[in-house]
């Protein structure tokens, strides 16, 4: 009995950039090729259970099949390695989720504010939507010493608040980082002294 | 134990074509590939093409692709290896053999078929 | 389309002989590889199937080594009946698949 997968796909967990191409291959293991008395041409290729047409695959070798997507529009696709066995019957080899995405954009207009007696807080424009978690983080640093990083929160993505307090009458450096799986940004640093930025309660 | 029977030898004119038939009995082939090769005299063996029964295709080595057809008759696990446009190099024994589907080697052969192409 | 080259091309020797009988593959095929014999005026006979694995029916005498792009068929003492030629066949590609260039046995 065949209790392990049949073979395996790679990549097994792929993120893609919406619109790009995108290659998985899938290769069977021997121990299934002589219990099934298959090889790679016998594999079938399918995505959310419609089968793929056969243009769209290579064989690599006898264990091996590859197929190819241009311009990836979906958000998600189940793709699933089939081979085809005895009495046409299909079995399953492996699935795969492929996420698809933006990478982030360089975020913009970045500015921070002093509420009196509290902490900075500083907001940006995060660009457009990705698709995908996509992490933004504050970072600010003085000449000689950096704080630490402000991560911001999945329910507000466009701001933070720093840990640490404010000093004031020293120049601090700020700037926003962006990165999810498909890529990182960094926005332009701004140069500031905190006292310039204290709002009055 | 399956054996593999081919159709007669033939003596063709350049520009005619040949259709050799290699009929399969004592086993199925359902799981199974058939695979032409074909020896000129005196030279090595060489593959032409093959025919995937459960999944109706054929593949063809590129250097016939255009003049030959490979094709089967299920019924009566027959497979038919069509070259046309033949000219006097395809002077040869041509080959019909089993195709062990996993792995790739030729189990059974068929006795051979010779083709003669003469003007 | 991956290349077969044997070697030697023909050889001699006696019955009782050990021969050796290589083959390269122009990349790596890992362990896709076939041995056949053909007498004249005969169709060939697998001896050898996955580089090492021996035929049903196939004297013990034959025996296949290697994986990758070398090779290796020896019979480990030549018989009257083994004076043939041998070929090598990858089935790694699929297809198409392809034999070496085929070594002629004959005797000393």
């Known amino acids: 009995e065949l209790l392990d997968p049949c073979g395996y796909i790679s990549p097994e967990s792929p993120v893609v950039q919406l619109h790009s191409n995108f290659t998985a291959v899938c290769v069977l293991k021997e121990k299934c090729m002589d219990y099934f008395h298959v090889n790679a041409n016998y594999i079938v290729w399918k995505t959310n259970h419609f089968t793929i047409p056969k243009e769209q695959y290579t064989i690599i070798n006898r264990t091996a099949s590859s197929v190819t997507f241009t311009d990836i529009a979906s958000l998600n696709i189940q793709l699933t390695c089939n081979i085809l066995t005895f009495g046409q019957l299909e079995q399953n080899v492996y699935g795969i989720t492929i996420i698809s995405g933006l990478p982030p954009e360089k975020p913009k207009n970045l500015s921070c504010i002093v509420n009196e007696g509290k902490k900075m807080r500083c907001e940006w424009d995060g660009g457009r939507e990705t698709h995908l978690e996509t992490n933004f983080t504050l970072k600010s640093e003085w000449a000689t010493h950096k704080f630490a990083d402000c991560k911001a929160k999945r329910d507000t993505p466009t701001s933070c608040t720093v840990d640490y307090s404010t000093v004031y009458f020293v120049n601090i450096e700020v700037w926003v980082e962006a990165e999810n799986a498909l890529g990182k940004v960094t926005s332009d640093h701004i140069n500031f002294d905190p006292v310039y930025k204290v709002k009055p309660n | 134990q399956v054996q593999l029977v081919q159709s007669g030898p033939e003596v063709k004119k350049p520009g005619s074509s040949v259709k050799v038939s290699c009929k399969a009995s004592g086993g199925t082939i359902d799981r199974n590939e058939i695979t032409w090769v074909r020896q000129a005299p005196g030279q090595g063996l060489e593959w032409m093409g093959v025919i995937i029964p459960i999944l109706g295709e054929a593949h063809y080595e590129r250097k016939f692709q255009g003049r030959l057809t490979i094709t089967m008759d299920e019924s009566t696990s027959t497979a038919y290896m069509e070259l046309s446009n033949l000219r006097s190099e395809d002077t040869a024994v041509y080959y019909c053999a089993r195709e062990r589907a996993a792995r790739g080697y030729l189990d059974y052969w068929g006795q051979g078929t010779l083709v003669t192409v003469s003007s | 389309d991956i290349q077969m080259t044997q070697s030697p091309s023909s050889l001699s020797a006696s019955v009782g002989d050990r021969v050796t009988i290589t083959c390269r593959a122009s990349?790596?095929?890992?362990?896709?590889l076939n041995w056949y014999q053909q007498k004249p005026g005969k169709a060939p006979k697998l001896l050898i199937y996955a580089a090492s694995s021996l035929q049903s029916g196939v004297p013990s005498r034959f025996s296949g080594s290697g994986s990758g792009t070398d090779f290796t068929l020896t019979i480990s003492s030549l018989q009257p009946e083994d004076f043939a030629t041998y070929y090598c066949q990858q089935s790694y590609s699929t297809p198409p698949i392809t034999f070496g260039q085929g070594t002629r046995l004959e005797i000393k």
């Open positions: 990349q790596s095929i890992s362990s896709y």
